[in-house]
């Protein structure tokens, strides 16, 4: 009956953690004698190829300083402690502690048997590191050129994390990769870049980080912050201003970042009706008269700049009873 070595084609272990490389000789055959078990790294330099051996009488040996006896152990193999007990070598599973990047590679588990001869199996050990993720907005001031408005950082992953962005905005991502402080790891930074405008301010975009150490992708929301000058509109005009009306008000509606620092009401004619009183963002009209047949201008300033809106007013002699007209500027 033929025997075979059962190993996993690939084993993944966490950087700094412990991993087991399973290796079993199957099936159990009466009279099949396992004389030696060895673990080798065929791709390593010659003086580091022999990783471990288990001799039925002498037990385990770990000749190479890397990984060495401090970090290696046979999980189940047992030597014959007395002459009347047989060694148990069918399970040659090897445990490797304190995983380093240098541990990554092919490992061959080999059973020297009689009478079948030598049989072996190979496992690829992959050393992975779970990255730490972080995303943040980068406050920018509006401009005509694309600039990074958010960044997402996946620190010290192995292999490098994959970063993408979820957003309805018109954007592009710029990615950089640098070596992590832990040897063999990579820190990935993705910058969410767009032409910054008020439309992007306060919008939430999502950084999506994928890594094989995650059960599912990490989703990190980021609220953008764009400093832009006031975007102004005027509301309150209902196309039914008539002589003597007393309940009229104009509002200066503003979107800006940061908040406005000042509002200024004026007219294009340069004549400002005395019955119109500016109260910050509102213009309160005590009584409409013929001087209101003009264009009102609201000018708003903030730390970034200035914005203005105009509203043309038409003063009727009598109320318009045909129904309310359109409002807004």
């Amino acid at each position: 009956q033929d025997v075979r070595v059962q190993v996993l084609p690939e084993v993944r272990g966490q950087l700094g953690g412990t991993v087991e490389l399973p290796c079993h000789l199957l099936p159990p055959v009466p009279g099949l004698y396992i004389s030696l078990v060895t673990w080798q790294r065929p791709d390593a330099p010659p003086d580091h190829q022999n990783v471990a051996a288990f001799h039925p009488k002498m037990g385990p040996s770990f000749p190479s300083p890397k990984p060495g006896s401090q970090r290696l152990s046979f999980v189940s193999a047992k030597q014959s402690t007395r002459q009347d007990t047989e060694a148990e070598l069918q399970d040659a599973t090897l445990a490797l502690r304190g995983l380093t990047v240098e541990d990554e590679g092919n490992y061959t588990c080999e059973f020297a048997t009689f009478p079948k001869g030598s049989v072996r199996g190979m496992t690829w050990l992959r050393v992975i590191a779970k990255p730490q993720n972080h995303a943040e907005a980068q406050e920018v001031t509006f401009s005509q050129d694309p600039v990074p408005v958010a960044r997402c950082i996946s620190k010290e992953g192995r292999p490098p994390a994959r970063i993408s962005w979820l957003s309805s905005l018109d954007w592009e991502a710029k990615e950089t990769q640098v070596s992590g402080t832990l040897a063999g790891t990579v820190t990935v930074t993705s910058r969410f870049t767009l032409v910054p405008s008020g439309r992007a301010d306060g919008v939430t975009v999502t950084c999506k980080v994928e890594h094989e150490s995650f059960e599912e992708p990490a989703l990190i929301p980021v609220t953008l912050s764009v400093r832009y000058p006031p975007e102004v509109s005027i509301s309150g005009y209902d196309d039914n201003w008539y002589l003597g009306r007393t309940d009229a008000t104009l509002s200066c509606d503003v979107h800006s970042n940061p908040e406005p620092t000042g509002y200024d009401w004026s007219t294009t004619s340069g004549i400002f009706p005395t019955s119109a009183v500016a109260q910050g963002s509102q213009l309160v009209i005590h009584a409409v008269d013929s001087l209101f047949n003009t264009t009102f201008v609201c000018t708003v300033t903030n730390a970034v700049g200035m914005g203005r809106a105009e509203q043309v007013i038409f003063v009727r002699e009598t109320p318009n009873t045909a129904g309310a007209g359109a409002t807004g500027g």
């Epitope: 190829q49 000749p63 080999e110």
Partner: antibody, heavy 116, light 107 residues
Framework: EVQLQQSGTVLTRPGASVKMSCKAS????????IHWVKQRPGQGLEWIGA????????NYNQKFKAKAKLTAVTSTSTAYMELSSLTSEDSAVYYC?????????WGQGTTLTVSS | DIVMTQSQKFMSSSIGDRVSVTCKAS??????VVWYQQRAGQSPKTLIY???YRYSGVPDRFTGSGSGTDFTLTISNVQSEDLAEYFC?????????FGSGTKLEIK
């Protein structure tokens, strides 16, 4: 302590047969193969074959298949090798040995001289 | 069968010298090689197994190296008790085969 005690020196004629013994002690006889190795002066070592006392299974080097017969008697923990149709080429020291990782335990050897 | 060739039948060394005994396999045997020492009138004793692993109680002046087809037993700081014959053996494939031996003589 593991011991393999072999039978003494044999002097015999060409064409004859001889049966030599290897008595084992100090371990479970039925659990390990007993191997036989031939050594001629200046000719190195040759593996003849092995017998597994647990089920009397045997395994031979093809070169010695017609020459040697390996058996074991569990009741006396003794392995035997019978050599037939002897010629001067068979004159050698024959060792029984126990495989524990390597051939870790050896008998003292049986010297066979075939001469007319 | 796999042929294990020890090309040097004899080697001569002085006490304290370093000497290397070589063994070549006719085909790849991995690291499945043992080195034995046989003193005159005695049975062989294991020195090295799996090409480079030193057997229990063997002085560390004995080291084994090699894999595949080329193997070396190195004795550094040769002592008078090292006067013996040295054999390599492969256990990769049935039948097991031995080298023809290298006799170390002390000047």
């Amino acid at each position: 302590e593991v011991q393999l005690q072999q039978s003494g020196t044999v002097l015999t004629r060409p064409g004859a047969s001889v049966k030599m013994s290897c008595k084992a002690s100090g371990y479970i006889f039925t659990s390990y193969w007993i191997h036989w190795v031939k050594q001629r002066p200046g000719q190195g070592l040759e593996w003849i074959g092995a017998v597994y006392p647990g089920n009397s299974d045997s395994n031979y080097n093809q070169k010695f298949k017609a020459k040697a017969k390996l058996t074991a008697v569990t009741s006396t923990s003794t392995a035997y090798m019978e050599l037939s149709s002897l010629t001067s080429e068979d004159s050698a020291v024959y060792y029984c040995t126990k495989l524990v990782g390597t051939f870790d335990y050896w008998g003292q050897g049986t010297t066979l001289t075939v001469s007319s | 069968d796999i042929v294990m060739t020890q090309s040097q039948k004899f080697m001569s060394s002085s006490i304290g010298d370093r000497v290397s005994v070589t063994c070549k396999a006719s085909q790849n045997v991995g690291i499945n090689v043992v080195w034995y020492q046989q003193r005159a009138g005695q049975s062989p004793k294991t020195l090295i197994y799996s090409a480079s692993y030193r057997y229990s109680g063997v002085p560390d002046r004995f080291t084994g190296s090699g894999s595949g087809t080329d193997f070396t037993l190195t004795i550094s700081n040769v002592q008078s008790e090292d006067l013996a014959e040295y054999f390599c053996q492969q256990y990769n494939t049935n039948p097991f085969t031995f080298g023809s031996g290298t006799k170390l003589e002390i000047k």
